[in-house]
């Protein structure tokens, strides 16, 4: 109720002779601060004096003085909250009741605390979980109702007297609620720990033994078994007998059932500790164990591997990998059930024994097409030789072999022919599915093994084909060697380098760009007349009469090709000049007379000069000299001169006769 002082502290504190005691304590006074404090040992209230009698262990007064003999007991509190006490060392006769007499200005209070001091260190207490099962982690707790700052202690765990390897966690509590030291040990017990003694040992700071507590572990576990077999190596031959015995070395609680397992599967009607196998077969080979159960669960023995030996069974071959690509590596594995394992193998390729191959595996580092076929094997062990199984097929894949491009046409091939080529090959695996031809067209097209080239070109030189399965193999290119008539035939002037003048030496060349076959003949022609059969046409001294249209022809066995007509032009000075007179060389006076200077010239005459019988040049320079009206005085011999870029030429004299008219005669 509200008229009480409020205290908090452990109800009883425990210690032993020579140790110390630390009393955690808090309080709240009814009014004001603490003015006086006395610690009694077994206080008794004296009704006569209305005071407490008893041994005063500690006393503090208003003036704060403490008797010198009270150093063993210390008040560590204050005037309003803390009432913590320490007794160091503590003695056996300190056992009993401690009385804390508190006085404030107006109020008084006696608070009692029990102190239990034993003669020797008291033992800690081990706490175990209600049930311990093998391999399940448990926490072992060792508790000691003691802790004091001035007296350090330690708790150590021992298993069968040997310190335990697991790390323990020690904790202390010095609070108003509780005072203790606790050690906790996490530990996974095994079935072998069953019945073993665990000790928690109390030691002082130097490790000196003070006291201990012990418990015996009760570890629940599945039955622990041992299996024995006759014969001891568990290796027998078909028809032999085998005995297996199951022994329980430990079980907690007691076992209830027994069974036998082979390769993890329970054997029916086998519920005793002995398993008898009579006249074993190879199928009875396997891993055997016995299983015994209790309330915790089933326990299994170690496995016994029973080997029933027999000769190899018919073998099979595994190929890694088929189909195989030529040049790759392949491994063959001979698989045959046998016990003991085969020690020797015989390999066969297409029924023929492979010499020097006696291992379980055959490795071929570089497969070739001839390696294809059926592979089989025979396995052998100490008990005999197996039978040859059906074998496995190795398929060796490779690009088409020996690809050739073959021209089907009769030779020679001529320009414009239709050429047929075939793409041939020797062998292929997988089969050829397509062909390719080179050169390609602009639009690659599907092609069979035959290529038809219509209207073959003169320059179609080489063709190659490829036969393709998963890979393409190219043949060497073949030359079509197309034959054609000479090409690009033309006339070329070799000399002179400049224009041709009459009298020059002239050479014309008949050129062509190519011809197949190369052997050719030449023909020169002018106006349909054959001039020569050489590649060159030569003129030692060209004359104007040689001018004209020339063609050359080049022919080979395929055909002949003509050049375009080439015009030969000869330049010469005016020649064959003559003066012609119109209307004639006799003209009547008063009429008109026209003299014309006729000539042959290349280039044409560009300039004319007229002369009279006195070789006097006349003031006329055109081709025609017109006299109108003509006079008798004009009678006489005339000549003309013609000029071109090459030179000059003159005509012979031509005489003009002008006669008198009848009128003139009549006048006379």
């Amino acid at each position: 109720d509200s008229s009480k002082w409020v205290f908090e502290h452990p109800e009883t504190l425990y210690a032993w002779e020579g140790a110390c005691v630390w009393i955690p304590c808090t309080y709240r006074a009814l009014d004001g601060d603490l003015e006086s404090f006395i610690l009694f040992h077994n206080p008794e209230y004296n009704k006569n004096t209305s005071k407490f009698d008893g041994t005063r262990l500690y006393e503090s007064t208003k003036d704060g003085k403490v008797p010198s003999e009270q150093k063993r007991v210390q008040f560590l509190g204050d005037k309003n909250k803390n009432c913590t006490l320490s007794i160091h060392p503590v003695h056996l006769n300190d056992s009993g009741q401690l009385g804390l007499r508190m006085e404030s200005k107006t109020e008084k209070w006696m608070e009692r605390i029990h102190l239990n001091v034993s003669e020797r260190p008291f033992p800690p207490h081990i706490q175990l979980p209600p049930e311990i099962q093998e391999s399940q982690e448990v926490t072992l707790t060792c508790l000691l109702n003691f802790s004091c700052y001035g007296y350090p202690i330690q708790l150590q765990w021992l298993l069968e007297g040997v310190p335990m390897r697991q790390a323990a966690v020690t904790s202390t509590s010095l609070t108003i609620k509780s005072v203790f030291t606790r050690s906790e040990l996490k530990f996974s017990p095994q079935w072998s720990h069953h019945g073993k003694i665990v000790t928690c040992q109390l030691q002082d700071a130097d490790g000196k033994f003070l006291s201990n507590d012990t418990v015996q572990l009760n570890v629940k576990h599945t039955p622990k078994l041992e299996i024995k077999v006759t014969p001891s190596d568990a290796i027998v031959r078909e028809g032999d007998s085998v005995t297996m015995t199951c022994e329980v070395s430990s079980s907690n609680p007691e076992y209830t059932t027994v069974s036998w397992l082979k390769d993890g599967t329970s054997l029916k009607k086998q519920n005793t500790f002995t398993l008898n196998l009579r006249e074993v077969t190879k199928d009875q080979s396997g891993k055997y164990c016995c299983q015994v159960s209790n309330d915790v669960g089933p326990g299994r023995s170690e496995e016994v591997f029973l080997q029933v030996q027999y000769a190899p069974e018919p073998s099979t071959v595994q190929i890694l990998h088929s189909p195989a690509v030529e040049g790759s590596q392949v491994e063959f594995l001979c698989m045959s059930l046998a016990n003991p394992l085969p020690t020797n193998y015989t390999w066969y390729h297409n029924g023929k024994e492979m010499q020097g191959r006696t291992e379980e595996k055959v490795h071929i580092p570089k497969i070739l097409p001839w390696h294809a076929g059926t592979y089989s094997c025979v396995a052998e062990n100490i008990l005999g030789t197996g039978q040859r199984g059906p074998g496995a097929e190795l398929d060796v894949q490779y690009p088409p072999k020996k690809v050739t491009t073959v021209i089907q046409n009769p030779m020679p091939i001529r320009e414009g022919d239709t050429v047929t080529l075939s793409c041939n090959y020797n062998s292929s695996n997988p089969s050829v599915t397509r062909y390719e031809w080179k050169p390609h067209g602009a639009w690659e097209e599907p092609s069979l093994g035959v290529l038809k080239i219509q209207n073959v070109g003169w320059d179609n030189t080489t063709i190659a084909c490829a036969a393709c399965n998963s890979w393409c193999s190219w043949a060497s290119p073949v030359a079509l060697n197309v034959q054609y008539a000479p090409r690009d035939v033309r006339v070329r002037k070799i000399k002179p380098l400049s224009e041709i003048h009459s009298g020059n030496s002239v050479s014309l060349q008949c050129d062509f760009s190519s011809s197949h076959p190369k052997e050719v003949q030449f023909f020169w022609e002018k106006n349909g007349r054959l001039l020569g059969k050489e590649s060159q046409l030569n003129f030692d001294s060209i004359s104007p009469e040689d001018a004209g249209s020339y063609s050359c022809w080049v022919n080979n066995s395929i055909g002949q090709t003509a050049s375009k007509a080439w015009t030969l032009e000869v330049l010469y000075a005016p020649r064959r000049l003559r003066v012609s007179m119109s209307p004639g060389d006799q003209v009547m006076e008063g009429k008109s007379a026209t003299l014309t200077c006729e000539s042959d010239a290349n280039p044409p005459v560009s300039h004319y000069t007229w002369f009279d019988w006195n070789n006097q040049s006349l003031p006329y320079h055109s081709q025609k000299l017109r006299l109108e009206p003509v006079k008798v005085q004009h009678s006489g011999a005339y000549w003309c001169q013609g000029t071109n870029s090459v030179g000059k030429g003159r005509s012979p004299l031509s005489t003009l006769t002008v006669y008198y008219s009848p009128e003139t005669i009549g006048r006379r």
């Epitope: 397509r434 080179k438 050169p439 390609h440 067209g441 639009w443 690659e444 097209e445 599907p446 320059d459």
Partner: antibody
């Protein structure tokens, strides 16, 4: 007479799709390898892709600029080749021609315009 | 473009003009060259196949040739109707498809 007629061109926005058709006549279509060629306005010719005949696998090959966006297919029963154009870009604009490699005959072309 | 052509060429009627086409060993060097003529507003038409072969109906004024990794198209006796774009083409082994030249615009003056 060998004849190829393209259709399906038109105006489409960037990122859009269009399907062109090429109907063939005058030759054995099922044996032919068919091609698409395009021509951007005022520019040269550019191969788009081709489809092989079914007997040669019927697979299609594409030029780098259209790979992954264009798909060529064929329906031999209809003598028709198709060009499915997805994720169209402005640079895909142009006239699209179909060509048969066997005879090197070109269609009259169909115009595709890709513009926003 | 994989194949290189001059962008333009010109000539007067009756003249001879040549258009070049340059490539590499993976196209022209090892495969046939084709030439196409594209008249304004029409589809390309085959002019020369297999380097120098003319399909029927193509005048002999058109001729093709190939040397090494280059090819050329020659047109002699030029006519006004020859005014068109000319393209060379060849199969390319490394690209596994046909490649074209950028085209040459021929103008008849």
């Amino acid at each position: 007479e060998v004849q190829l007629v393209e259709s399906g061109g038109g105006l489409v926005k960037p990122g859009g799709s269009l399907r062109l058709s090429c109907v063939a006549s005058g030759f054995t279509f099922s044996n032919a390898w068919m091609n698409w060629v395009r021509q951007a306005p005022g520019k040269g010719l550019e191969w788009v892709g081709r489809i092989k005949s079914k007997t040669d696998g019927g697979t299609a090959d594409y030029a780098a600029p259209v790979k992954g966006r264009f798909t060529i297919s064929r329906d031999d029963s209809k003598n028709t080749m198709y060009l499915q154009m997805n994720s169209l870009k402005t640079e895909d604009t142009g006239v699209y021609y179909c060509i048969t490699g066997a005879t090197d005959v070109w269609g009259q072309g169909t115009t595709v315009t890709v513009s926003s | 473009y994989v194949l290189t052509q001059p962008p333009s060429a010109s000539g007067t009627p009756g003249q001879r003009v040549t258009i070049s086409c340059s490539g590499s060993s993976s196209n022209i060097g090892s495969n046939y060259v084709y030439w196409y003529q594209q008249l304004p507003g029409t589809a390309p038409k085959l002019l020369i196949y297999r380097n120098n072969q003319r399909p029927s109906g193509v005048p002999d004024r058109f001729s093709g040739s190939k040397s090494g990794t280059s090819a050329s198209l020659a047109i002699s006796g030029l006519r006004s109707e020859d005014e068109a774009d000319y393209y060379c083409a060849a199969w390319d082994d490394s690209l596994s498809g046909p490649v074209f030249g950028g085209g040459t615009k021929l103008t008849v003056l």
